[in-house]
Interface confidence: medium
Amino acid sequence: APLATELRCQCLQTLQGIHLKNIQSVKVKSPGPHCAQTEVIATLKNGQKACLNPASPMVKKIIEKMLKNGKSN
């Protein structure tokens, strides 16, 4: 069976923001049948993953900057 990481919601808790210098890449997952909410999952430079609040103004700025740098998908 496909991995649940691709199927169900990942983010049980979210951060309002995080320092841009700590982020390696950002993945924005749109809502769909597998998860009803938008999820923003940042991969940090130390290899950890962090869920960010997509409604947070700071997170929106992070996504914009990562898109400019080509580090978002």
Epitope: A1, P2, L3, A4, T5, L7, R8, C9, Q10, C11, L12, S30, P31, G32, P33, H34, C35, A36, Q37, K49
Partner: antibody
């Protein structure tokens, strides 16, 4: 109070189609996905599929692809399931159940719609 | 598809007794992304739709009596009713909410002596 109100029982002939409805109230319809589950007489539960009401995107159990079609009408907060080419094997109670995919299971269920296929 | 196997298929107990029922999955239900088990338990009383009791393998839904406890991880899960009441007469189902298609166990029918 959250409520999922399903349409009434259906008696249909083999080969026909039926469309059953599930009207949501008491919560934001587009914030939760809608699942459909089949329960044959005295048997366990079978997941048919799920639809995201905000975007209309769906995922089906392979077993029910071509048999069930899931749709929504956002204006009336209603989810629909159409069953086609009905046979006696499709006689069952069909439930709608809301869920998010966020670990919380299917937290509210409709009362069920009985579909009987008989000539 | 993930296969969910429940045991026993039925059991009969007296009010006040402790009851344990098992649910085993053919694949792990542990989500590696957040270390949560995507397993739910439902109660279905005669003539009613299923009602969610437990999600995330061990979290009781709000309003569910604390005599109901879910436990387990990976592929082995348990629902325990610490002191069975007459109103607990029902069929109990576990459900894989880990990966599609969602699958249910065959159910455990609880009868009260």
């Amino acid at each position: 109070e959250f409520q999922l109100q399903q349409s009434g029982p259906e008696l249909v002939k083999p080969g026909a189609s039926v469309k059953i409805s599930c009207k949501a109230s008491g919560y934001s319809f587009t914030d939760y996905n809608m699942n459909w589950v089949k329960q044959s007489n005295g048997k366990s539960l079978e997941w048919i599929g799920v639809i995201n009401p905000k975007y209309g995107t769906t995922s089906y159990n392979q077993k029910f692809k071509g048999k069930a079609t899931l749709t929504v009408d956002q204006s009336s907060n209603t989810a629909y399931m159409q069953l086609s080419s009905l046979t006696s094997e499709d006689s069952a109670v069909y439930h709608c159940a809301r869920g998010m995919g966020l670990l919380f299971g299917m937290d509210y269920w409709g009362q069920g719609t009985s579909v009987t296929v008989s000539s | 598809d993930i296969v969910m196997t429940q045991s026993p298929s039925s059991l009969s107990v007296s009010a006040g007794e402790k009851v344990t029922m098992s649910c085993k999955s053919s694949q792990s239900l542990l989500n590696s992304g957040n270390q949560k088990n995507y397993l739910a338990w439902y109660q279905q009383k005669p003539g009613q739709p299923p009602k969610l009791l437990i999600y995330g393998a061990s979290t009781r839904k709000s309003g569910v009596p604390d005599r109901f406890t879910g436990s387990g991880s990976g592929t082995d899960f348990t629902l325990t009713i610490s002191s069975v009441q007459a109103e607990d007469l029902a069929v109990y189902y576990c459900q894989n909410d880990h990966s599609f298609p969602c699958t249910f166990g065959g159910g455990t029918k609880l009868e009260i002596k």
